[in-house]
Interface confidence: medium
């Protein structure tokens, strides 16, 4: 329970915290478990203890082993163990699993990748970030304090992210790198069979001959980003563009997101100078996504003008 795995790369700084916690006023003694040899506190040593922290500046492969920390208070002693492994630097790009910190998940709304263990070090911004060994470039990536923010997260953003920073100790600089995997999840997104909110099925819309009329096709498709979601109009089962009546045109409305967060679309059909023959047509509002297609049919009827002379 009071043992902690720590790892690092040779020639980089590694700082390890004692797994047993205590007040800052408590003294902490560190030992190399194999030999029970005390770790010095003098900072001139490459490996030295500094309270709850054990510092390797820089680390060497030979430093690998189990270190014991004893937190001493006036009334009790608490013992913890730090299992330290220092690895040789890899010549290729791949970061082996044993060097990876915990995987983090992100989504379109939350895409922070924290740099592991950075709070143990004396570092100054900015952090450098790499994905699969390539330096991150572009406005989508923002190094902010101790974490990376990715704008407009996509599934391709999944991968291994490495943060690199400089630890400063008494004027000397030491490099530190840490890598963790990032996975992308769809945050509560889902897709539904299209639901047409307007018009109602087999609706009759009253129009005035000679006037303009607008029909709105409105449908919702689910939450989150939708693949191939569309609303459109057909006339007598034919595409508007193929029907060949320039007075009747569809004009794309705005994407809408209602208060419940559903992804919805509008499409307005504009009929200029309504004519008698327009009353004979079948107007179909179609809503489509990968689940399928739904159609609501509208017909026009003549709106009788109010007789002001009666």
């Amino acid at each position: 329970k009071f043992s902690k795995q720590s790892w690092g790369l040779e020639n980089e700084a590694l700082i390890v915290r004692c797994p047993r916690q205590g007040k800052p006023s408590y003294t902490v003694d560190w030992y190399y478990s194999q030999t029970n040899k005390s770790i010095p506190t003098q900072e001139r040593n490459r490996v030295f203890a500094s309270g709850q922290l054990l510092k390797f500046l820089p680390a060497a492969v030979a430093d690998s082993g189990i270190y014991t920390c004893i937190v001493r208070s006036p009334t009790f002693n608490r013992t913890g163990y730090a299992n330290v492994t220092i690895y040789k630097k890899q010549s290729d790009c791949n970061v082996p699993d044993y060097l990876m910190y915990s995987t983090v998940s992100g989504s379109e709304k939350n895409s922070k990748i924290y740099c592991p263990t950075i709070d143990l070090y004396n570092w100054t911004a900015p952090l450098e970030w790499f994905k699969n060994c390539q330096a991150l470039q572009g406005s989508r990536y923002r190094a902010h304090k101790s974490f990376l923010v990715i704008d407009n997260v996509m599934t391709e953003d999944a991968g291994d992210y490495t943060c690199k920073f400089i630890h400063n100790e008494n004027g000397a600089n030491y490099s530190v790198t840490a890598t963790r995997s990032f996975t992308v999840k769809d945050e509560q997104g889902f897709s539904l069979f299209p639901v047409i909110g307007a018009p109602a099925q087999n609706e009759i819309k009253e129009v005035e001959i000679g006037k303009n009329a607008n029909l709105t096709c409105s449908a919702c498709f689910g939450k989150g980003t939708q693949f191939l979601a569309a609303v459109l109009w057909q006339l007598n089962g034919t595409k508007i563009t193929d029907f060949g009546e320039p007075r009747i045109q569809q004009e794309e409305g705005q994407n809408q997101s209602f208060s419940n967060g559903l992804a919805c679309l509008d499409m307005v059909l504009r009929i200029a100078d309504v004519k008698e023959e327009d009353l004979l047509l079948q107007y179909d509002c179609l809503a489509l996504n990968l689940h399928g297609l739904r159609r609501h049919t509208v017909r026009l009827s003549r709106k009788n003008p109010i007789d002001h002379h009666s």
Epitope: F193, L228, A230, L232, Q234, G237, T238, K239, T241, D242, Q250, E252, D284, L286, L288, L290, H291, G292, L293, R294, R295
Partner: nanobody, 121 residues
């Protein structure tokens, strides 16, 4: 019903390009949308790209910026231009179309027979 015939598949090296074509015939007057789907061995069929009769397009995240879907209405043909191909793009690519029936579930789309795309060095 719409009949669909795909062409343009083949073997290509990583980083290479291919252009798939999908010719539609039959009840194309009511065509609402056409799409490209793919199925890799041992995996489920997944959507790749789609185009609606109004011209709006959609892409799967994995192909955004690399693949482009377009349509030539005069030829009743949809195209999928695939650039910067990767080994993981290897799959049978299917063209699908949906017409304007009252209610059409995804399984009722009209499908082509598929064309094999292999990305390998």
């Amino acid at each position: 019903e719409v009949q669909l015939v795909e062409s343009g598949g083949g073997l290509v090296q990583p980083g290479g390009s291919l252009r798939l074509s999908c010719a539609a015939s039959g009840s194309i007057y009511s065509l609402v949308a056409m799409g490209w789907f793919r199925q890799a061995p041992g995996k489920e069929r997944e959507a790749v790209a789609g185009i609606v009769s109004g011209g709006s397009t959609s892409y799967a995240d994995s192909v955004k910026g690399r693949f482009t879907i377009s349509a030539d209405n005069s030829k009743n043909t949809a195209y999928l231009q695939m650039n910067s191909l990767k080994p993981e793009d290897t799959a049978v690519y299917y063209c699908a179309a949906v017409g304007g029936a009252t209610t059409v579930t995804a399984s009722e789309w009209d499908w082509g027979q598929g064309t094999l795309v292999t990305v390998s060095s």
